[in-house]
């Protein structure tokens, strides 16, 4: 995991400010609200997780 | 580095209650979901309960095993969650440990704390 | 809720063999883009530990022996070479809804 303006976060992650790390692209289906999301927006956005079937 | 520490497990008969408490640190507790998971030698691991954010309202999501007699609760300035558990029965007799997730990966678990239901 | 099925149950490896553990859900736990499955280590007498994130993402300082794969129903846990250190029993956990479960476990020995 990389501090902003050194290497870049790892591929499928982005960095988050609010957390000071790389964070996984894969759980904005489930936070999409999360700062680092921006970040991960060559991603397509998925649904939002289902709670209960 | 991150510390998990659950405690107020022990022996209760069945139909009885029980509080368990788990600190944490070592995170940014107040930006993680917080969850309850169990093991025991029949049923392995079950996740038990999950509560959310301020921001979220503190929703909160029980396993069918748990809805209507278990409640989690957390309190922020103390970095704490907590699983109040009543009417007890002796399947609810696990190891019970405490998990951080951001969103789907249970990031650390605590030593766990045992609870045992029986007369 | 989503049934996770691993095999084999048991297993024993040599030292420095492959170890490989199956991890079968009862729908897919996968988008276009990711995979909604982890992986965790639990040694005799300790906590569970994250392994493997969204299905072979590997969690810091995991070492890199270990290798997840898969996607849809189907997902597969490697390790190789196996270390004697590996001797603990392997969960696989999917987070695609709610309830989250596991599944039954595999435990490694190694000879």
């Known amino acids: 995991e990389q501090a902003p303006g050194t290497a870049p976060c790892s591929r499928g992650s982005s960095w988050s400010a609010d957390l000071d790390k790389c964070m996984d692209c894969a759980s904005c289906r489930a936070r999409p609200h999360s700062d680092f999301c921006q970040g991960c927006a060559a991603a397509p956005p998925a649904p939002f997780r289902l709670l209960w079937p | 580095e991150v510390k998990l520490g659950e405690s107020g497990g022990g022996l209760v008969q069945p139909g009885g209650s029980m509080k368990l408490s788990c600190v944490a640190s070592g995170f940014p507790f107040t930006k993680y979901w917080m969850n309850w998971v169990r093991q025991s030698p029949e049923k392995g691991l079950e996740w038990v309960a999950e509560?959310?954010?301020?921001?979220?309202?503190?929703?909160?999501h029980y396993a069918e095993s748990a809805k209507g007699r278990f409640t989690i609760s957390r309190d922020d300035s103390r970095s704490s969650v907590y699983l109040q558990m009543n009417n007890l029965r002796a399947e609810d007799t696990a190891i019970y440990y405490c998990?951080?997730?951001?969103?789907?990966?249970?990031?650390?678990w605590g030593q766990g704390t045992s609870v045992t239901v029986s007369s | 809720d989503i049934v996770l099925t691993q095999s084999p149950a048991s297993l024993a490896v040599s030292l420095g063999q492959r170890a490989t553990i199956s991890c079968k859900a009862s729908q897919s736990v996968s988008t276009s883009t990711y995979s909604y499955m982890q992986w965790y280590q639990q040694r005799p007498g300790q906590s569970p530990k994250l392994l493997i994130k969204y299905a072979s993402k590997l969690d810091s300082g995991v070492p890199a022996r270990f290798s997840g794969s898969g996607s849809g129903t189907d997902f597969t846990l490697n390790i190789h070479p196996v270390e004697e250190e590996d001797t603990a029993t392997y969960y696989c956990?999917?987070?695609?809804?709610?309830?989250?479960?596991f599944g039954g476990g595999t435990r490694l020995e190694i000879k």
């Open positions: 509560i959310r954010l301020k921001s979220d309202n503190y929703a909160t």
């Open positions: 956990q999917h987070s695609w809804e709610l309830p989250y479960t």
């Open positions: 998990s951080p997730t951001y969103a789907d990966t249970m990031d650390y």
